[in-house]
Structures are given as structure tokens and as C-alpha cells.
């Protein structure tokens, strides 16, 4: 619970509220410091600040409440309740509530701990949500090489909008036992599946860091079988030295595949978002957006109105495609019973044609036993390229013992011919390597995030029984915290081996590189924060978890270690790859300029119940510097783009923006004038946590 | 329609106080940040102070700070202006505005 | 503060003909979001400013078609491609991409 500021003073807890669509939404008994459901027994989530505002003056109307403000971090809420129904619901959704401010507005006083420096910002020329305000502070302690600590907003200009952040740094030392309690907060993630997700929603709905859950749904006990046996990993964290990749493809140890409710209703949700039909709306604007087209299997361009509409409505392809590609796909292979590893892999253009040797492998799709299959076909690669060298040498011999009485120019075209057959072998062959190994990794990757998938849902639903069992809990969390260091170490390898084949695509790919690594950051972190919200469960198993983030840090640094100072990798048989010499130079594996440093590859933190693991971008596209990217929508109803007050919208026949040569006539048009009343919107993103289980 | 009606404005002495009053209707008052606008006798028009829609920001410029104050009651869709210390620079005709939409104005002058 | 310059300070015009009035801004009105926070304002003599184009090309409620906004960044025009006798008064330009709101020092157009 945050503490109460000077505008409740006497009470017992802070005015909040919490929302999770297809819920009644909750508001915190301020005298008893419980979660209350909504008195009316009508109110689910709202989607804009003002009604937030509103809502939070209609819960608590004994006090004065005049903002809003998101919380800085998610809290478990337990007992949420349909519309209708007598009986609630006990099972919980982690949200992050709103804080509803109390009288004139007071900064949030925060502690500063021994060696940390309390800092500010103010800008009276922004005007900017508290997601603006947190990358700022988190961005202002990276640059002094501190971590966040916690964060509060200064100088309100608007619902849930300020002029400046208030925040505590401290060294990256300190914050192993307190790694930016704020951070946990779901930052860019609208919660999308909420209602429709309208221009001028301003992303407002609560932030679920849980994914949506279908209560009618029946509940699936995960019939687990002896903790000792969760424990018997086979997976532990040393590197086998003949294959990078081998260790991210042994075969897994067969988990019970029992689907959580959480999975299935995202993917749900996902498939149902995605294949929603692309809808305008009914306001005029002509805002460029994106859309799923099932059909296609692709994103589309659309027009949407600005207001209305559904969620299938995304501000850019990437997103679209992040959000539905994945699934959409996932769920016609699941339809058609075929394992998620078995995504068609791009195959690279070098390859001029697919050789035998190598044909069964890239036509089998991947399975369990990748790593056999992918060593079989190396090794009929090589045999291949050796039987076929030695034909030519026999042949270049047989031609050079012909060759003895003709002319020198004939001799000499005879070796050029044969120089040129071997060249043309190798050149052949290294393709043929190259898109072994591509598809070899494609698949892993698959692998990867599908045990990843896993792992996040066996843990989720680990801290979700009722009531949870710390030491399955732990399981689960060590396996899906394997199932990350291995993506990340995959990522880290791939990119190496581009590096070394192709140093401009490298370049071109970093920013990508650095994003993954990046997501997998803030989706680890974003997990582990989930721990910190049954302090019971935290409390018992602390020190297994510390000891545990230790191990995998410290393997993380000797990963990056080997990374910064072999210029090369090892496919397990350097026969496989073609002669790099030229190429070993000044390795960079990713730029330590100030555009990304090996501190943002680090995820492992230990840190104090009492502390919850940072998350701060969420990005799941490539990165962009724009702390609130989009703000182009309002908070105010059907304002911005639109230009239209709801409350007028029958009396507009068109946009003014839209309407310039029509013979519509406009009254009483009402424009969002000031810049500072622009709100952020990030349109239909989905957070990683969601990521985690759908996208990834 | 969109109305906003000024009141308050007078004649007043260089040091004495005033207090402005803007009457909205025809839009929700309560979603728009307001502002007060002056225009010098020159005709040259300055921001004087501005507040966000909840009132929990106010902005002024360095001329007013200190001696101008902006609020709001949105439950009576009014914005005030109180101004003290005033100067005879502050004599102005004084326009409550949403931004796109401006009162007739309110005429204050300060002179002995 | 973001400074607004506006030329000429005063345009005569016959009826009919073509007006162009011009405006710059210290620095850019582009708001993250893209839009364009720039505007126009038409002052008829003894009335308050009323909004003529907003967000650099966007006629407001009412804005005959004869009148045009256009430009970039920190460069704006307003052109009228026939000057009504109702046109006439003083145009001013302004920002409200950065607090503090400001505008330029007008623009009067007159007959010749």
C-alpha cells in the first residue's frame, strides 16, 4: 500500500481504485485497507482519466479528490465480481491501480537510502503522463550508472498528467537488495483487451500485469507430480563446450502440459482480437492505422474514425504483427495439431538450391530431438562436400595428366576451370552451412520461446494455486528463469554468428538485438516482480531465489565476457563454417556508446521481499527513444484527432480536419487547442507479461 | 454554443485589487484548460495565466507571478482571476479564452 | 518562451485581391504527436480574437474556404484568395505547442 499522503491523513489506507475489464471494478475501503467492489454493481473499467476522476469522486465522495495517478506498481487484488452475480470470483488478478489524490495536490515523500541521491525534474513546458515521467527518471539514473529506486510525480497540469518526477537514484551496487520498486509497473501496456479500444481511451484502462481470464473457463488443476521430481531440472547452467545451441535444445523434461486458464483465455482473447473485422468507426477522422487480416495472414492498412471501433486497431504493422502474427499463426498450427516448432523458417537467400544431403533436415519439421537431427544433417553436409571435393580432385588430376603435352594457355585454362569448380563447391557448400545453421536456429528459437511459454504459465499458475506451495513455486520459477537466460544466450550467439558472416546485416540487426535482449530484461524482471505479490510465498523462498539470480548472473557475465572477447563461435565443427580470418577485427558486439551498454543485458538482480524487480520500457518492437511514443490522442473524449466533444457528436456531421470542400456545416466544434491537453496513447500494445505468454 | 462571459473589470488604483470572473457554458468546463488573456491598449495580446482543467496547475508569466491568481470552480463552470499589487501596466482589456473559443472581455484599468 | 514573428504589420488591400500574411515561429510547434500546434486569429475592430485555422491548415466552425493555412515546423501562412470587406481587422498568429501560450503581434489588414 502506498502511504497515505497529508490529504488523508486518519485514514487507514489511500484512496484507489483498480479495473479489470469484464470485472466490477474495485475501490480501496479506505478505513479497513480491503478492496471493496463497486458499490452500484454496475461500474467496469473505464476508459478515459476523466472517467477515472469521476469514478474515484463518485467511490469516495466524503473526500475531496481532485486527480489522478497511476500507481507505481501492480498489486494482487483477490475477489472480483461480474456484473450480476452474488458470488465473486476469489481468483486473483495482479492490476495496477490509480491512486486517487486527495485535496491539493502533494508530492510523494520518498525515502532516500544510505548512498542514494534524491533528484528532480521540472519542465513547465511539458505537460506529460506518469509514463513519461518514470522513463525519464529511470533514463536520468541510467545515465549516472544508478538504478531507479522509486519515483513520484510533481507539478499536476491535467488528469494523470504532470509537469515534472521526483526520484530516488542509487548505486547499482545498492540496488541488489532494491532493484526500482516503482518499476514494475506495466508502463506502455494499454490493456488493449479491455473494452474497444477507442482513440481517446488515452490507454487509461488498468494495467493488468495477469493476462484476462475466461470464468467460464473451468478452472485446470495442474496435477503435479513430487516437488523433488519439479526439481530434477537436467538443465543445468553450464555451457557443453562442442555446441553453443545444444544446450538451449536438449530435450525437456516432460512437464504436465495441462493449459492454464490464463494461456488459453489470452490466446483466446488474441485470436479474437485478431480476427475481428477492420472497423472504422463512427467519427470521421481518417487516422492511418493497422489491422490483422485472417485472410491474408498479414497486417493491413485502414482507416479508422477515431473513435469506436475495436481492437483490432493497431498505430503500427510491427505491433500488429507482434501481436497478431505470433498468435494467429500459433493457432492455425495448433488447429492443425503441429508443435509450435515447427514455424516455417525463412530460409536465406544465399542458398541457390536446397541440397540433398541437407533436404531431409530443412523438410522434417523441428521436434524434440533438434539437436540430433541438426548434428546428423552437419554431418551429411560435410560428408557431401567432402565426397564431391575429392570427385573434383580426381577429376582436376585425371585432367591435369591430359593436359601434360597441350599448350600452356591450355594447362592454364584447365587449372583456372578447376579453381573455379572447387571455389564454386565451397561457396556452395558454406550456403549450405549458412542455411543449416539458420534454420537450425530459427527452430531453436521456436523452441526456445515455446518452453519459455511454458515455464511462465507452470510458474503463474504455481503462485496462483490456492494456496501456493513455495517450494513448487521456486521449481517453476528456476525453470522459466532457465528458459529466459537461454533465449537471451541464444539471442547473444545468433547475433554473434551473423557478425561473423555478415558484419552488415550485424549492423543493420543490432537495434533488433538489442530490443530482444532488451524484452527478455523487462519480461524476466516483470515475472519475477509477480513473486514479490504473495509475500508469503516471496518471504520462504527468498534466499534460493537470491542464490539462484546470483548463479545466473554470474553465468550472464561470463557469457558477455566470452561474447566481448572470442570474435568467433563455434557450431561444434569449425569445418562447418567458412574461413572468417579476415573478419577477426575489433569486436563489437554491440555498440557501448550510450546506445546500449552491457549494463542493459544484465537482468539478474537479487533483491529483498519487500522489492519488486525493475521493468521500465516494455517495448516489443524495436526501441524508440520517445519516452511516450503516439501521443498523438487526447484525454479528453473524442477530442484530438477527432476534434469532437462526445457529448456533441450527434450535433458534428464531419471533422473539420476532414472537411475543408463538403457542404457540411459544423457547430460548436470544440478543439483540444493547448498541446499540453494532448494525451498519450499507445493504441493496442500488449505488455510483456502478456508477451511473455502470447507473443514471445 | 460555446459562451464565455467576463465580469469584474473596473478602474482601480496602482497597488489596489481585483478580482475577475468568466462564466463558461456550451462545453464541458471541466475537460479544457483555461486561461486569461490580455491586450494592451498597443493591441499586443500576452498570456497572464493559465490552469489546467483539474486546477491542480497554474502557469503565469514572469510579469503577474506573485501578484495574479488563477482558479477555477468546475462545479460552477467559472474561472476567476484575483489580481493584487496591480500596476498601471496591467491596464488591459482581459479575455477569459479555452483556446479556441474568447470571452467579449473585460476592460481593467489601473491609474490614479 | 517561443517567440512569434508575424509580417507585415500592415497590409492594404483592394477587394477581391489576394492577401498574404506571414508568421515564424523561435521554434518548432511540432508536438510529439505529430500535430502541428499553430494557429491563426482574426480580431474584427471592437470584438475579442476569434480562432480562424488552427493546427497550421484546419479551418475552424464556420471559416469560409477563401482563407488558408499552410507551412511547417517554424514557417506558417495565411493566405485569403479574395479579400471581403468582412475580412477585414487584425490577423495574429500563435503557438500553443509549449506553455507559455503566445502569439504574434499581428497583422493589420486594411483597404487601400
Known amino acids: 500500500l502506498e502511504v497515505p499522503t497529508d490529504g488523508n491523513a486518519g485514514l487507514l489506507a489511500e484512496p484507489q481504485i483498480a479495473m479489470f475489464c469484464g470485472r466490477l471494478n474495485m475501490h480501496m475501503n479506505v478505513q479497513n485497507g480491503k478492496w471493496d467492489s463497486d458499490p452500484s454493481g454496475t461500474k467496469t473499467c473505464i476508459d478515459t482519466k476523466e472517467g477515472i476522476l469521476q469514478y474515484c469522486q463518485e467511490v469516495y465522495p466524503e473526500l475531496q479528490i481532485t486527480n489522478v495517478v497511476e500507481a507505481n506498481q501492480p498489486v494482487t487484488i483477490q475477489n472480483w465480481c461480474k456484473r450480476g452475480r452474488k458470488q465473486c470470483k476469489t481468483h486473483p488478478h495482479f492490476v495496477i491501480p490509480y491512486r486517487c489524490l486527495v485535496g491539493e495536490f502533494v508530492s510523494d515523500a520518498l525515502l532516500v537510502p544510505d548512498k542514494c541521491k534524491f533528484l528532480h525534474q521540472e519542465r513547465m513546458d511539458v505537460c506529460e503522463t506518469h509514463l513519461h515521467w518514470h522513463t525519464v527518471a529511470k533514463e536520468t539514473c541510467s545515465e549516472k550508472s544508478t538504478n531507479l529506486h522509486d519515483y513520484g510525480m510533481l507539478l499536476p497540469c491535467g488528469i494523470d498528467k504532470f509537469r515534472g518526477v521526483e526520484f530516488v537514484c542509487c548505486p547499482l551496487a545498492e540496488e541488489s537488495d532494491n532493484v526500482d520498486s516503482a518499476d514494475a509497473e506495466e508502463d506502455d501496456s494499454d490493456v488493449w483487451w479491455g473494452g474497444a479500444d477507442t482513440d481517446y481511451a488515452d490507454g487509461s484502462e488498468d494495467k493488468v500485469v495477469e493476462v484476462a481470464e475466461e470464468e467460464e473457463v473451468a478452472e485446470v488443476e495442474e496435477e503435479e507430480a513430487d516437488d523433488d521430481e519439479d526439481d530434477e531440472d537436467g538443465d543445468e547452467v553450464e555451457e557443453e563446450a562442442e555446441e553453443p545451441y545444444e544446450e538451449a535444445t536438449e530435450r525437456t523434461t516432460s512437464i504436465a502440459t495441462t493449459t492454464t486458464t490464463t494461456t488459453e483465455s489470452v490466446e483466446e482473447v488474441v485470436r479474437e482480437v485478431c480476427s475481428e473485422q477492420a472497423e472504422t468507426g463512427p467519427c470521421r477522422a481518417m487516422i492511418s492505422r493497422w489491422y490483422f487480416d485472417v485472410t491474408e495472414g498479414k497486417c493491413a492498412p485502414f482507416f479508422y474514425g477515431g473513435c469506436g471501433g475495436n481492437r483490432n486497431n493497431f498505430d503500427t504493422e510491427e505491433y500488429c504483427m507482434a501481436v497478431c502474427g505470433s498468435a494467429m499463426s500459433q493457432s492455425l498450427l495448433k488447429t492443425t495439431q503441429e508443435p509450435l516448432a515447427r514455424d516455417p523458417v525463412k530460409l536465406p537467400t544465399t542458398a541457390a538450391s536446397t541440397p540433398d544431403a541437407v533436404d531431409k533436415y530443412l523438410e522434417t519439421p523441428g521436434d524434440e530431438n533438434e539437436h540430433a537431427h541438426f548434428q546428423k544433417a552437419k554431418e551429411r553436409l560435410e560428408a557431401k562436400h567432402r565426397e564431391r571435393m575429392s570427385q573434383v580432385m580426381r577429376e582436376w588430376e585425371e585432367a591435369e595428366r591430359q593436359a601434360k603435352n597441350l599448350p600452356k594457355a591450355d594447362k592454364k585454362a584447365v587449372i583456372q576451370h578447376f579453381q573455379e569448380k572447387v571455389e564454386s563447391l565451397e561457396q556452395e557448400a558454406a550456403n549450405e552451412r549458412q542455411q543449416l545453421v539458420e534454420t537450425h536456429m530459427a527452430r531453436v528459437e521456436a523452441m526456445l520461446n515455446d518452453r519459455r511459454r511454458l515455464a511462465l504459465e507452470n510458474y503463474i499458475t504455481a503462485l496462483q494455486a490456492v494456496p501456493p506451495r513455495p517450494r513448487h513455486v521456486f521449481n517453476m520459477l528456476k525453470k522459466y528463469v532457465r528458459a529466459e537466460q537461454k533465449d537471451r544466450q541464444h539471442t547473444l550467439k545468433h547475433f554473434e554468428h551473423v557478425r561473423m558472416v555478415d558484419p552488415k546485416k550485424a549492423a543493420q540487426i543490432r537495434s533488433q538485438v538489442m530490443t530482444h535482449l532488451r524484452v527478455i530484461y523487462e519480461r524476466m524482471n516483470q515475472s519475477l516482480s509477480l513473486l514479490y505479490n504473495v509475500p508469503a510465498v516471496a518471504e520462504e523462498i527468498q534466499d534460493e531465489v537470491d542464490e539462484l539470480l546470483q548463479k545466473e548472473q554470474n553465468y550472464s557475465d561470463d557469457v558477455l565476457a566470452n561474447m566481448i572477447s572470442e570474435p568467433r563461435i563455434s557450431y561444434g565443427n569449425d569445418a562447418l563454417m567458412p574461413s572468417l580470418t579476415e573478419t577477426k577485427t575489433t569486436v563489437e558486439l554491440l555498440p557501448v556508446n550510450g546506445e546500449f551498454s552491457l549494463d542493459d543485458l544484465q537482468p539478474w538482480h537479487s533483491f529483498g521481499a519487500d522489492s519488486v524487480p525493475a521493468n521500465t520500457e516494455n517495448e516489443v518492437e524495436p526501441v524508440d527513444a520517445r519516452p511516450a511514443a503516439d501521443r498523438g490522442l487526447t484525454t479528453r473524449p473524442g477530442s484530438g484527432l477527432t476534434n469532437i466533444k462526445t457529448e456533441e457528436i450527434s450535433e458534428v456531421k464531419m471533422d473539420a480536419e476532414f472537411r475543408h470542400d463538403s457542404g457540411y456545416e459544423v457547430h460548436h466544434q470544440k478543439l483540444v487547442f493547448f498541446a499540453e491537453d494532448v494525451g498519450s496513447n499507445k493504441g493496442a500494445i500488449i505488455g510483456l507479461m502478456v508477451g511473455g505468454v502470447v507473443i514471445a | 454554443e460555446v459562451k464565455l462571459v467576463e465580469s469584474g473589470g473596473g478602474l482601480v488604483q496602482p497597488g489596489g485589487s481585483l478580482k475577475l470572473s468568466c462564466a463558461a457554458s456550451?462545453?464541458?468546463?471541466?475537460?479544457?484548460?483555461m486561461s486569461w488573456v490580455r491586450q494592451t491598449p498597443e493591441k499586443r495580446l500576452e498570456l497572464v495565466a493559465e490552469?489546467?482543467?483539474?486546477?491542480?496547475?497554474?502557469y503565469y508569466p514572469d510579469t503577474v507571478k506573485g501578484r495574479f491568481t488563477i482558479s477555477r470552480d468546475n462545479a460552477k463552470n467559472t474561472l476567476y482571476l484575483q489580481m493584487s499589487s496591480l500596476k498601471s501596466e496591467d491596464t488591459a482589456m482581459y479575455y477569459c479564452?479555452?483556446?479556441?473559443?474568447w470571452g467579449q472581455g473585460t476592460t481593467l484599468t489601473v491609474s490614479s | 518562451d517561443v517567440v512569434m514573428t508575424q509580417t507585415p504589420l500592415s497590409l492594404p488591400v483592394s477587394l477581391g485581391d489576394q492577401a498574404s500574411i506571414s508568421c515564424r515561429s523561435s521554434?518548432?510547434?511540432?508536438?510529439?504527436?505529430?500535430?502541428?500546434?499553430f494557429h491563426w486569429f482574426l480580431q474584427k475592430p471592437g470584438q475579442s480574437p476569434k480562432l480562424l485555422i488552427y493546427?497550421?491548415?484546419n479551418r475552424f466552425s464556420g471559416v469560409p474556404d477563401r482563407f488558408s493555412g499552410s507551412g511547417s515546423g517554424t514557417d506558417f501562412t495565411l493566405k485569403i484568395s479574395r479579400v471581403e470587406a468582412e475580412d477585414l481587422g487584425v490577423y495574429f498568429c500563435?503557438?500553443?505547442?509549449?506553455?507559455?501560450?503566445?502569439f504574434g503581434g499581428g497583422t493589420k489588414l486594411e483597404i487601400k
Open positions: 521554434q518548432s510547434l511540432v508536438h510529439s504527436n505529430g500535430n502541428t500546434f
Open positions: 500563435s503557438q500553443s505547442a509549449h506553455v507559455p501560450w503566445t
Open positions: 456550451g462545453f464541458t468546463f471541466s475537460d479544457y484548460t
Open positions: 479564452a479555452s483556446g479556441d473559443y
Open positions: 493546427k497550421v491548415s
Open positions: 490552469i489546467s482543467n483539474t486546477g491542480g496547475s497554474t
